[in-house]
């Protein structure tokens, strides 16, 4: 069982793992999104554009992810079930200026089953 | 024997090797498809169009492949049989805009026979 204190859309169940969605404004063209569990950076995704508008995506921590024009979703196959953890997203906006950094709303995730297998329950 | 936790159409048996199919929407005109084994990129295929609509196919890792209008199939002649491995496809969509990157559903492949010779079994 999963408990999420954030908006339920932040967490969803996929193929035995958890998808954590980090939203950002559609006006943002170039960004860095990081997913934290407590103080630990689990995932980092950077999207930039070159002088010819070519897009570069860097995923140095090799996380499974999906990028759209207003969110980055990270897929955790083996979320830490030993204890409840607080997950949150940190957004760096490179473009449009000025440069900004902000922590997005987070959520508390607790996995009671030893494996995520069957269903997802959320309390808000 | 091969175990695949993904859609069985992702893996199929061909001439002593494995064909791994990576599906994409038919509307996609320009793309990059990468095949991962765990964190390692095994194959990469990029299809782009030039100003005169001439198609360019780049296959920098020199993989055997087949490209159709809705899938890229990569052929692995000697899949790593020392241990079970998780394979997945990563799709970058250049056209139509907006640019998107997404990791497609993957599958777990375990080869029990010393050689792939006779049949393919999949459990889902």
């Amino acid at each position: 069982e999963i408990n999420g204190s954030a908006d339920h859309r932040m967490f969803s169940f996929h193929n035995g793992g958890v998808q954590i969605s980090c939203k950002y404004p559609e006006t943002v063209q170039q960004l860095k999104m990081r997913l934290f569990r407590e103080r630990e950076v689990l995932c980092e995704l950077t999207k930039t554009k070159g002088s010819g508008n070519a897009v570069s995506i860097k995923n140095p921590m090799l996380c499974l992810y999906h990028l759209s024009n207003n969110s980055v979703s990270f897929f955790l196959n083996n979320p830490d079930s030993s204890q409840g953890s607080y997950y949150f997203c940190s957004l760096s906006i490179f473009d449009p200026p000025p440069f900004q950094e902000r922590n997005l709303s987070g959520g508390y995730l607790h996995i009671y089953e030893s494996q995520l297998c069957c269903q997802l329950k959320l309390w808000l | 024997e091969i175990n695949g936790s993904a859609d069985h159409r992702m893996f199929s048996f061909h001439n002593g090797g494995v064909q791994i199919s990576c599906k994409y929407p038919e509307t996609v005109q320009q793309l990059k498809m990468r095949l991962f084994r765990e964190r390692e990129v095994l194959c990469e295929l990029t299809k782009t169009k030039g100003s005169g609509n001439a198609v360019s196919i780049k296959n920098p890792m020199l993989c055997l492949y087949h490209l159709s209008n809705n899938s890229v199939s990569f052929f692995l002649n000697n899949p790593d049989s020392s241990q079970g491995s998780y394979y997945f496809c990563s799709l970058s969509i250049f056209d139509p805009p907006p640019f998107q990157e997404r990791n497609l559903s993957g599958g777990y492949l375990h080869i029990y026979e010393s050689q792939l010779c006779c049949q393919l079994k999949l459990w889902l």
């Epitope: 006006t27 010819g52 449009p96 | -």
Partner: antibody, heavy 117, light 111 residues
Framework: EVQLVESGGGLVKPGGSLTLSCAAS????????MDWVRQGPGKGLEWVGN????????YYAPFVKGRFTISRDNAKKTLYLQMNSVKSEDTATYYC??????????WGQGTLVTVSS | DIVMTQSPSSLAVSPGDKVTINCKSS??????????LAWYQQKTGQAPKLLIF???TRHTGVPDRFMGSGSGTDFSLTINSFQTEDLGDYYC?????????FGPGTKLEIK
């Protein structure tokens, strides 16, 4: 302060080769796309090509046609332009530039390449 | 490739004059809310310097007498009160697609 310093220019014969370098300082080099822009004597600015942050992707102007290669060494904070099969029309001042997300916000002083027999 | 044109190619000006340089692209540079166009100044014997990005946003440290405007295919750079230190060549440049291209330049000279 952002600084870009080009070197390696000089006289080269048609068909010859030359490698230009650009030493970067004052910013996190590995966070930025980098470009080469050139300017022929008495002429305008012409984009040569660029390279992404980790050097995995490069793009080139049509006139390059496989003759030039852009690379980078992030550990050394250095950008390179390898020029092969040079022609007289490649005579120009070559500028190393930083793509600051939405424009070329920093330029080197330039290095002159003269192609002549 | 997108072709950039500029007019005039040269202009003789006096200190205090209002100066306007025009730039035209062969296709629209508007994407979302942004026009992918920048302006640069190049003084004799020096490297170019960024003045304006996204068609109308002044780069850090650029005096407010420099103003960029326009959208789509038609853009202009205005110097509201020309100073002698503004002498030089001015280039527009798009970054809408690869290759990014520059206009041929406009030279400002003293009248």
């Amino acid at each position: 302060e952002v600084q870009l310093v080009e070197s390696g220019g000089g006289l080269v014969k048609p068909g010859g080769s030359l490698t230009l370098s650009c030493a970067a300082s004052g910013f996190t080099f590995s966070d930025y796309w980098m470009d080469w822009v050139r300017q022929g004597p008495g002429k305008g600015l012409e984009w040569v090509g660029n390279i992404d942050e980790d050097g995995s992707t490069t793009y080139y102007a049509p006139f390059v046609k496989g003759r030039f290669t852009i690379s980078r060494d992030n550990a050394k904070k250095t950008l390179y332009l390898q020029m092969n099969s040079v022609k007289s029309e490649d005579t120009a001042t070559y500028y190393c530039t930083r793509w600051g997300r939405y424009a070329f916000d920093s330029w080197g002083q330039g290095t002159l390449v003269t192609v002549s027999s | 490739d997108i072709v950039m044109t500029q007019s005039p190619s040269s202009l003789a000006v006096s200190p205090g004059d209002k100066v306007t340089i025009n730039c035209k692209s062969s296709q629209s540079l508007l994407s979302g809310n942004y026009n992918y166009l920048a302006w640069y100044q190049q003084k004799t014997g020096q490297a170019p310097k960024l003045l304006i990005f996204y068609a109308s946003t002044r780069h850090t440290g650029v005096p407010d007498r420099f103003m960029g405007s326009g959208s789509g295919t038609d853009f202009s750079l205005t110097i509201n009160s020309f100073q002698t230190e503004d002498l030089g060549d001015y280039y527009c440049q798009h970054h809408y697609s690869t290759p990014p291209t520059f206009g041929p330049g406009t030279k400002l000279e003293i009248k």
